[in-house]
């Protein structure tokens, strides 16, 4: 805590500028008006204050806004954001996507910190749902963001937001998450034609039920093995050899290399040997 001392004569700061980097901590505390700081927060980011000095500036803002900072201040926090605790951020009401982007930019290149996670949580809860623009922004900064959400949280994603999702955004999702996302994707892409639909739905298929896989097998989609290996085992087991052959098309030969891995292993064990032999791959049930 900085000791409270009177500001020396002639040192009262008329504005926030680089001359303040020469102030000791107690001088910053005594000579910088908190209201002035709040209105000129955008200047702080341009000045290489030490972390110690930033602590003093944060303390001044905390005293001015004990209930939490207004968005006009939050938007211009810059690297002072890195000094905020999750407890500080829980007091904020961030509604502007521009504010969110500005703060995510500060943390860019780093893993998602507890501060950022809290900020995102506050923002999304404030909006009531993960709309497309928000999802676009979050996945641009953190490709794994979607898969960090619980199935319950994912249930608030409207189907229209699914258009913002890229295949790499789903790389770390588990089956429970894809179970929630797949029906939304199916709804979002329902008006697309066969081949275009498959391109879009492909990365969500880890949540697809058997009947949808059967339907896809009738559309010459040529699913690759990597996608097939991510399908739910319980959805694959009821598929016939003919259906899997149609689903994979020319990629069916890849089953041999995967015969010891789920879901291929379990599927093979469910098939009649005569049917497997029709593939000519030497698969043993």
């Amino acid at each position: 805590e900085v000791e409270k001392t009177a500001c020396p004569s002639g040192k009262k700061a008329p504005e926030i500028d680089e001359s303040l980097i020469f102030y000791k901590k107690w001088e910053l505390e005594a000579c910088v008006d908190a209201a002035l700081l709040a209105t000129q927060m955008d200047r702080v980011n341009a000045i290489p204050f030490t972390y110690e000095q930033l602590d003093v500036l944060k303390h001044k803002l905390d005293e001015l806004y004990p209930q939490g900072y207004p968005e006009s201040v939050i938007q211009h926090l810059g690297y002072l954001f890195l000094k905020m605790s999750p407890e500080d951020i829980r007091k904020w009401n961030v509604t502007s996507l521009e504010t969110l982007k500005a703060l995510l930019e500060v943390n860019k290149g780093h893993e998602m910190s507890p501060q950022v996670a809290t900020l995102i949580d506050r923002f999304v809860k404030g909006r009531g749902q993960l709309d497309k623009d928000t999802l676009d922004t979050l996945t641009a900064f953190y490709p794994g963001y979607l898969c960090s959400l619980s199935p319950e949280e994912l249930s608030s994603v409207p189907p229209s937001s699914i258009w913002a999702v890229r295949p790499q955004d789903l790389d770390t999702c588990d089956p429970r998450q894809l179970d929630v996302l797949y029906p939304k994707a199916r709804l979002a892409f329902q008006n697309m034609n066969g081949s275009e639909y498959f391109v879009k739905i492909q990365s969500f298929l880890g949540g697809a039920p058997t009947e949808d896989l059967k339907a896809l097998s009738q559309q010459n989609v040529s699913m690759d093995l990597a996608t097939f290996m991510k399908l739910r085992t319980d959805a694959v087991l009821p598929l016939t050899v003919a259906e899997v052959q149609k689903l994979l098309g020319p990629h069916v030969e890849g089953l041999k290399a995967e015969e010891r891995h789920r879901p291929v292993r379990d599927w093979i064990l469910r098939q009649r040997q005569d049917d497997l032999d029709t593939l000519g791959l030497g698969l043993q049930g």
């Epitope: 680089e18 980011n45 341009a46 000045i47 290489p48 204050f49 030490t50 972390y51 810059g78 690297y79 930019e105 500060v106 860019k108």
Partner: nanobody
Amino acid sequence: EVQVVESGGGLVQPGGSLRLSCAASGITFSGNYGGWFRQAPGEQRELVASMSSALGTKYADPVKGRFTISTDTAKNTVDLQMNSLGPEDTAVYYCYARVRLSRGGWGSEYWGQGTQVTVSS
């Protein structure tokens, strides 16, 4: 790993001169921010001199005209030439480096361990 190391401190008589040098590894002073702080006994740390392409060269009022900060890009050092030293300049002097972010603003900061400068007869 970034390291910032000071050298050149010592005991000097009033009116004398000293040259402090700060060598950095893992960060270049060119395009970033380099400075010298000092901390006298019982006092808080204060910036003495700094330089960066963004802000130019700056000095604290008590040292203006006596201290000169300079950088050697080839050696990646920031030096502080101190002339006309007085007892009030006695302190531990710290080198400071700050990363300038390409998108604006300032990133991580790095401090040296400090070097003692004592001005006494």
